[in-house]
Interface confidence: low
């Protein structure tokens, strides 16, 4: 039959070449002469000439050694043709299988493998996997089957068998307990790969196992006890830096310290933070310390790590004895703001109050006093006793210095410390009213018509407080009651001024005496401008003479100018009056006076 079974040819054959492998034979060769040929890669296409065939005998020839790792199988076609070149058989498949020889050593994929494992892990924990390859066949032979082993371990601490490697997978794992980064941070393993499943050629590589840090070391205080001195009253004062050592990896969460005050700070006076660079605990005051209350604090500070402990570890505690340094503290007035009631107008030298300060220091320091701010200069203070006395007249009604009956004074206390310190206090004198002001009418100038005059209502004010105010009483003095009346209203807080007799146009002084509920009398002169008009008036209509009739004051130089105008008007007035043939009593007086003034002017 025109069929060939697959041909197995070992690689690396020694020849001699050409080497006969198999004979192609067509049973058509009985009828005619047959010529044989082969085609395909390895024959007439690359790699050309590896195989050939004897044209007439059909022997398949191998011309050179084969390399399985290059080509493991050749697929050729055999051809049979007659002398005339006609094909006598269909092309035949020829399979040439190159069989393996153990001609390659294993090769590790890396010269150095790197892996890591946490310190303190249990045996059986996987670390890393290494890989070696072998180009030889591992399917039909053991030539390419690699077996892994550990040749050596450095260092050999705590002993020389800390790791194992899986024979076939190359997985390295921990075989013994006792990995301690702080003692051995890194192991170097020399690993082997051997083909023939461990019986063949060997190659080596290095596996470096880094031991990763676990928080298996507690931070420890060095020293464990501290003494510090802190001035009293200072907030944010750095008291002490506490130093710890930790064998874990610097700047890792297993190394970074966390501090807590676990005792001795009942008053919550302190706080502790971690310095980001030095890892020290920085103890500072959160509140001011008070030497007089407690001159020493013994604090207990505990330190842990940012990361939780990987194993059960004792927590370190330090003792910090904080000694409070005495500082000269300012005297404090008691109370800081003192309210004292005092009658206004008390005599000079009269005591007002005693206002003293206490010194927080317990050294019986001498305190001296003085007034710091006394706007009106009404007070003095005894430097030794703190006795405040009046040196001026306290006036409740003095609006410049007194607000809402209160006169505010600032006083100062100074101790004799070194250096001296001062404290201030506020003295609020509530001035008790005395009936030292009589009632005063407002306004004090009025304008009123001399015909059907409107009653003038004047408000009465009294700077004093009740009961030294209304109801008020009014009385006209100095003959003002001849022409005027003054009556206080029912409420007793206004006075009504009325013109009861005719007065010619002029300015008059009305002498009004008002007295309050406490009979404090005040005389006020009301300036009344009487106008020639009827009913209500704001200002006198037309030109008017500002003479001194009826007790009015002279208009001075202005009168001279006004008289010129009056003289001109006088003629007109005479004509009007003579025509009307009517002359009232007040008109006669007025014209008579005008005539006199005209003569004076001409003179």
């Amino acid at each position: 039959d025109w069929v060939v079974a697959p041909i197995s040819v070992p690689e690396n054959g020694k020849g001699p070449f050409p080497q006969r492998l198999n004979q192609l034979k067509s049973n058509k060769d009985r009828d005619t002469k047959i010529f044989y040929s082969i085609t395909g890669p390895g024959a007439d296409s690359p790699p050309e000439g590896v195989f050939a065939v004897e044209k007439e005998t059909g022997w398949l020839l191998l011309n050179k050694p084969l390399d399985r790792e290059e080509i493991a199988k050749y697929e050729l076609f055999g051809h049979a043709v007659s002398e005339n070149g006609a094909s006598v058989e269909d092309p035949m498949n020829i399979s040439i299988i190159v069989t393996d020889q153990n001609d390659h050593k294993p090769k590790f994929t890396q010269d150095t493998f790197r892996g890591s494992v946490l310190e303190g892990v249990l045996p059986g924990t996987s670390v890393m996997q290494v890989t070696a390859t072998d180009e030889d066949d591992a399917i039909y032979t053991y030539n390419g089957v690699v077996a892994y082993s550990i040749h050596s371990q450095e260092p050999k601490d705590p002993h020389d068998l800390m790791f194992t490697i899986h024979r076939s997978t190359g997985t390295i794992s921990v075989i013994s307990s006792g990995l301690d980064r702080e003692k051995v941070p890194e192991y170097t393993l020399t690993i082997q790969a051997t083909d023939m499943d461990g019986d063949g050629s060997t190659t080596t590589a290095v596996a470096v196992v880094e031991i990763l840090d676990a928080n298996d070391n507690a931070p420890m205080f060095e020293p464990q006890k501290y003494e510090a001195w802190v001035p009293e009253n200072e907030v944010g004062h750095e008291v002490q830096r506490l130093t710890v050592t930790d064998l874990d990896v610097p700047n890792s969460p297993a190394w970074r310290a966390t501090y807590h005050i676990v005792g001795g700070d009942d008053g919550d006076h302190f706080t502790i933070t971690t310095h980001p660079e030095t890892n020290q605990g920085v103890l500072t005051t959160k509140k001011g310390l008070d030497f007089e209350a407690q001159d020493q604090h013994t604090l207990y500070v505990e330190v842990t790590n940012e990361a939780p402990f990987a194993v059960k570890l004792p927590t370190a505690t330090a003792t910090v004895v904080v000694h409070v340094k005495d500082v000269n503290e300012a005297p404090v007035f008691v109370p800081p703001s003192k309210v004292v009631e005092v009658q206004e107008g008390i005599p000079t030298g009269e005591p007002v109050c005693v206002y003293t300060a206490e010194d927080p220091d317990k050294e019986n320091q001498k305190i001296s006093y003085r007034i710091l701010r006394d706007p009106a200069g009404w007070l003095a203070m005894d430097p030794d006793s703190g006795q405040v006395t009046a040196v001026g007249t306290l006036d409740r009604e003095d609006e410049q210095f007194v607000r809402n009956n209160i006169y505010e004074v600032m006083v100062l206390a100074m101790d004799n410390g070194s250096p001296p310190t001062t404290g201030t206090g506020t003295l609020l004198l509530t001035l008790i009213d005395v009936n030292d002001h009589g009632p005063v009418p407002e306004p004090r100038q009025i304008t009123i018509c001399n015909q059907s005059p409107v009653r003038q209502v004047l408000n009465i004010t009294d700077k004093d407080l009740s009961p030294h105010t209304s109801p008020f009483q009014a009385q006209l003095t100095d003959d003002s009651d001849i022409y005027w009346t003054a009556e206080v209203n029912e409420e007793g807080d206004t006075v009504v001024l009325s013109l009861k007799k005719f007065l010619k146009q002029d300015t008059y002084d009305v002498h009004l005496s008002l007295s309050d509920h406490g009979n404090k009398e005040q005389l006020t002169v009301i300036r009344a401008t009487v106008c020639d008009c009827h009913g209500h008036v704001e200002t006198c209509p037309g030109p008017w003479k500002g003479g001194s009739g009826g007790g009015g004051s002279g208009a001075g130089v202005i009168a001279v100018i006004v008289v010129v105008v009056i003289a001109i008007v006088a003629g007109i007035v005479v004509l009007v009056i003579s025509r009307k043939k009517r002359m009232a009593k007040y008109e006669k007086a007025e014209i008579k006076e005008m005539g006199e003034m005209h003569r004076e002017l001409n003179a």
Partner: antibody, heavy 120, light 107 residues
Framework: VQLVEQSGAEVVKPGASVKITCKAS????????MNWVRQRPGKGLEWIGH????????NYNGKFKGKVTLTADKSSNTAYMQLSDLTPEDSAVYFC?????????????WGQGTTVTVSS | ELVMTQTPSSLSASLGDRVTISCRAS??????LNWYQQKPDGTVKLLIY???RLHSGVPSRFSGSGSGTDYSLTISNLEQEDIATYFC?????????FGGGTKLEIK
């Protein structure tokens, strides 16, 4: 009145030990460090160490470690200083002195001193 | 340890004189400088603490000043009872240390 009174003079042989007492009165003995100071003949003052009677806590000047042991008895308001393995070099006046509430800061109240003479 | 250097080691003055004793620290002691008086009978008393603060019962003729490393004790009006040896002492660093002393005599 705050008082610190010391025991009387001691004459001891080389190699022996001596225990000096210091009795306090007029203040809260437990709350203040009690210091010990040495003055050799014709010399200055040297701080030996101190004890906090409240908890028995002690601190020593390095040069006196091993030579001196400080103790205190709160119940009797008494502080003690034991000097051991005495040599003539240890002959001195030893003072106890009460801190003013701040360790090492200043010594406010002093005992009258105890003279120790080491002589064979 | 911190060294305290006191000058002069001895001094002679007349009654009524103003006397000054100096003390220098080998490093900054932040005003924690105290002065003691040791009488001829051996008794020791605190005069001044924290550079300038007079201890209770000490006459006002004693005063102290200074800062950093340099400090002084002044007796403004020397009296017979002031005849003594004076020591400075720093309380800023452990261990506390004393100056060598200044022996004050009357001329």
């Amino acid at each position: 009145v705050q008082l610190v009174e010391q025991s009387g003079a001691e004459v001891v042989k080389p190699g022996a030990s001596v225990k000096i007492t210091c009795k306090a009165s007029g203040y809260a003995f437990s709350s203040y460090w009690m210091n010990w100071v040495r003055q050799r003949p014709g010399k200055g003052l040297e701080w030996i160490g101190h004890i906090y009677p409240g908890d028995g806590d002690t601190n020593y000047n390095g040069k006196f470690k091993g030579k001196v042991t400080l103790t205190a008895d709160k119940s009797s308001n008494t502080a003690y200083m034991q000097l051991s393995d005495l040599t003539p070099e240890d002959s001195a006046v030893y003072f106890c002195a009460r801190d003013r509430g701040s360790f090492g800061a200043w010594f406010a109240y002093w005992g009258q001193g105890t003279t120790v003479t080491v002589s064979s | 340890e911190l060294v305290m250097t006191q000058t002069p080691s001895s001094l002679s003055a007349s009654l009524g004189d103003r006397v000054t004793i100096s003390c220098r620290a080998s490093q900054d002691i932040s005003n924690y400088l105290n002065w003691y008086q040791q009488k001829p009978d051996g008794t020791v008393k605190l005069l001044i603490y924290y550079t300038s603060r007079l201890h209770s019962g000490v006459p006002s003729r004693f005063s102290g000043s200074g800062s950093g490393t340099d400090y002084s004790l002044t007796i403004s009006n020397l009296e017979q009872e002031d005849i003594a040896t004076y020591f400075c002492q720093q309380g800023n660093r452990n261990p506390p240390t004393f100056g060598g002393g200044t022996k004050l005599e009357i001329k």
